[in-house]
Interface confidence: medium
């Protein structure tokens, strides 16, 4: 069964900067990756970025840069402009649409006790939505 992993990482140098890493474990080619926060895409979450292997990427504030790391993983840099750190308690979700498997989505957040520079383990916590 395909699996999606999500890591949320606070940058050690900039406490207002976070990076979300997501990856797809499984066969098939990825046709679209959607990163959202506050919940799954289309289920209360808000899109932060979409990455298409041919059409490039689109990201929206507070996302700073979305990019492919490998053919099956992406990273999204986030800039927290506020004085407080809302990202710390936020859920980030990554949805991978692949052919022929369909869509697989997983969510993760920064662990409550995270030290800067430490990241959450790659917890798949799959949301059972294989469209």
């Amino acid at each position: 069964t395909p699996e999606v992993w999500v890591q949320v990482q606070m940058e050690a140098t900039e406490l207002s900067s976070f990076t979300v890493h997501c990856g797809f474990l499984g066969p098939g080619s990825i046709s679209l990756v959607t990163v959202s926060w506050g919940g799954p895409d289309g289920a209360g979450g808000t899109k932060l970025a979409v990455l298409h292997p041919e059409l490039g990427t689109r990201q929206w504030a507070p996302a700073r840069q979305a990019r492919w790391e490998t053919q099956s993983s992406i990273s999204l840099a986030l800039e927290d402009s506020g004085a407080s750190s809302p990202f710390a308690n936020t859920t980030f979700c990554c949805k991978f649409a692949s052919f022929p498997e369909g869509s697989w989505e997983s969510c993760g957040s920064l662990p409550p006790s995270s030290d800067p520079g430490l990241s959450a383990p790659p917890t798949p916590v799959p949301i059972l939505r294989a469209d």
């Epitope: 959607t34 808000t46 899109k47 979409v50 298409h52 041919e54 059409l55 490039g56 929206w60």
Partner: antibody, heavy 120, light 107 residues
């Protein structure tokens, strides 16, 4: 079904501002972008910019920076475009259109348009 | 900005004919091109997305093709209701840009 309902025609004086609205139904505003497009009488289409209401982070075509301001009210599913310091060059029909980032990566559904006439 | 050129400003055709409307991008836009139809006094309607995919409800006599810099919208078995302006759009790079439009006239 997806529908975008735009506000009625506007008649404004040079130098004034107008605020056009675009009410989305049949989907959640925050799941898609909203683009705005200008069309002067008998002319082609000009892309003004796009707002992704989930993030309130508009992108403007250079030509419309300072002229158009795009906002959205997520609770009422309405997108807005304010046009400021109006001149006769701003007389046109303005369309809102939904930008889809799942399948289309472009505008898929369009509003009926709002006519803006600038005249003294 | 990417310039989209529709060299034919107006094309004349007859009912039942086949017509091809072309659009050329000033740089490679992959398959990030959409085609829109605008009938007189109406708002634009989406015909084709991602160069070759028909929008919901669009008759199969409308076909999009091309990638890179050269794109074509082909209408086979032209109907009188196809009288309209046709615009291409590139959405590879912001700002998105439209072609100047091609008016289809039915003889």
């Amino acid at each position: 079904q997806v529908q975008l309902q735009q506000s009625g025609p506007e008649l404004a004086r040079p130098g004034a501002s107008v605020k056009l609205s675009c009410k989305a139904s049949g989907y959640t505003l925050t799941s898609h972008g909203i683009s705005w497009v200008k069309q002067r009488t008998g002319q082609g289409l000009e892309w003004i910019g796009e707002i992704y209401p989930g993030s309130e982070s508009p992108y403007y075509s250079e030509k419309f920076k300072g002229k158009a301001t795009l906002t959205a009210d997520k609770s009422s599913n309405i997108a807005y475009m304010q046009l400021s310091s109006l001149t006769s060059e701003d007389s046109a029909v303005y369309f809102c259109a939904r930008s889809d980032y799942s399948d289309y990566w472009a505008m898929d559904y369009w509003g009926q348009g709002t006519s803006v006439t600038v005249s003294s | 900005d990417i310039v989209m050129t529709q060299s034919q400003k107006c094309m004349s055709t007859s009912v039942g004919d086949r017509v091809s409307i072309t659009c050329k991008a000033s740089q490679n836009v992959r398959s990030a091109v959409a085609w829109y139809q605008q009938k007189p006094g109406q708002s634009p309607k989406t015909l084709i997305y991602l160069a070759s995919n028909r929008h919901t409800g669009v008759p199969d006599r409308f076909t999009g093709s091309g990638s890179g810099t050269d794109f074509t919208l082909t209408i086979t078995n032209v109907q009188s209701e196809d009288l309209a302006d046709y615009f291409c759009l590139q959405h590879w790079n912001y700002p998105w840009t439209f072609g100047g439009g091609t008016e289809l006239e039915i003889k």
